[in-house]
């Protein structure tokens, strides 16, 4: 799986979208999990409604919300009041039984709030290859790794 980078500003909300084939994943609940390192396990953060037909209803866990457009094939995750510790590697998953298919790997990057003058000397406007080598930049403030690239670098 390629990794898509979504950048958000500290204190603001960040929306992450995960497109998928609505027919292939028909009837399946979805989940958002945080990966503990590139090769580590993925810890569930929030999942869609227990009743698949009600997947459009937004479900919250703390400051993270999930909603699923099952007809359009788009899973949307909202991270409210984004904080530095929200940065990291995540996955959008499609659930079937005890198994989970990865829909998208996501790297969330948190940028300093340009209006927060306490951090005025610490503003970060990352270049295209700040976290990933030769990463392709999409203009939805997200970018994808090209095939064969690895998240950069593999920290603790």
């Amino acid at each position: 799986h390629n990794t898509t980078v979504f950048q958000g500003v500290a204190g603001q909300s960040l929306q992450v979208s995960c497109p998928y084939d609505s027919m292939k994943h028909w009837g399946r609940r979805k989940a958002w999990c945080r990966q503990l390192g590139e090769k580590g396990p993925c810890q569930r953060v929030v999942s869609t409604h227990n009743l698949w037909l009600l997947s459009f209803l937004r479900r919250w866990n703390g400051s993270t919300a999930i909603t699923d457009d099952t007809l359009g094939g788009t899973l949307t995750i909202t991270l409210r009041n984004l904080q530095p510790h929200d940065a990291g590697l995540y996955q959008c998953q499609s659930l079937h039984g005890s198994e989970a298919d990865t829909l998208r790997k996501v790297l969330v990057e948190v940028l300093a709030d340009p209006l927060d003058h306490r951090d005025a000397g610490d503003l970060w406007f990352p270049g295209e290859s700040e976290s990933f080598e030769d990463a392709h930049v999409e203009h939805s403030i997200s970018r994808s790794l090209l095939e064969g690239e690895i998240p950069f670098p593999p920290t603790s």
Epitope: E38, A112, W124, P154, T155, S156
Partner: antibody, heavy 120, light 107 residues
Framework: QVQLVQSGAEVKKPGASVKVSCKAS????????IHWVRQAPGQGLEWMGW????????KYAPKFQGRATITADTSTSTAYMELSSLRSEDTAVYYC?????????????WGQGTLVTVSS | DIQMTQSPSSLSASVGDRVTITCHAS??????LSWYQQKPGKAPKLLIY???NLHTGVPSRFSGSGSGTDFTLTISSLQPEDFATYYC?????????FGQGTKVEIK
């Protein structure tokens, strides 16, 4: 028991090469990145490079590019670090280190270290 | 390469003291910072990952904070077994780089 066991101390002459091994037990090295870090006597820690044993991909600090070679044999769950064209300043303890990569790895294992002495 | 600068390079403290070590990165590294403890003749031990997360089995007197370029390791009440050298390490880009270390000695 999860551990990384490194090969024994080595004494080498300048210009020679050394190959240090690091055998994993209690876990599969394909599930981890294996890093090599060295520490000269009385000095700090210096990251040399890493390998992803799953696909053999490796990356090196610029200082060691071309002189260090990191490999892994998944059949024996062993990683290797070979350093060529040795000089006296390569005298150090060499550590292997396994983790799950960046972005919040909660796994962190270290070998006991291998002292490499370069002396004529 | 990203340069990591620790301060102080050494400090003397007594058992029960509150100790603070700082680490400054030459570039923004978000929260991708780890703290290690090393005792003479031993391999480093991970204390803190992702700037503020306590590694499994590490006593709660250790804590980490910071993001961006400035980070802090705090030992709330120094214990005899805490006398060691502490290193920060960045994991934002390759090569991974360490601070020069802070040696915590008995006063």
């Amino acid at each position: 028991q999860v551990q990384l066991v490194q090969s024994g101390a080595e004494v080498k002459k300048p210009g020679a090469s050394v190959k240090v091994s690091c055998k994993a037990s209690g876990f599969s090295i394909e599930d981890f990145y294996i890093h090599w870090v060295r520490q000269a006597p009385g000095q700090g820690l210096e990251w040399m490079g890493w390998i992803d044993p799953e696909n053999g991909e490796s990356k090196y600090a610029p200082k060691f590019q071309g002189r260090a070679t990191i490999t892994a044999d998944t059949s024996t769950s062993t990683a290797y670090m070979e350093l060529s064209s040795l000089r006296s300043e390569d005298t150090a303890v060499y550590y292997c280190h396994a983790d799950h990569g960046n972005y919040g790895s909660t796994m962190d294992y270290w070998g006991q270290g291998t002292l490499v002495t370069v002396s004529s | 390469d990203i340069q990591m600068t620790q301060s102080p390079s050494s400090l003397s403290a007594s058992v029960g003291d509150r100790v603070t070590i700082t680490c400054h990165a030459s570039q923004h590294i978000n929260v991708w910072l780890s703290w290690y403890q090393q005792k003479p003749g031993k391999a480093p031990k991970l204390l803190i990952y992702k700037a503020s997360n306590l590694h499994t089995g590490v006593p709660s007197r250790f804590s980490g904070s910071g993001s961006g370029t400035d980070f802090t390791l705090t030992i709330s009440s120094l214990q005899p077994e805490d006398f060691a050298t502490y290193y920060c390490q960045q994991g934002q880009t390759y090569p991974r780089t360490f601070g020069q270390g802070t040696k915590v000695e008995i006063k």
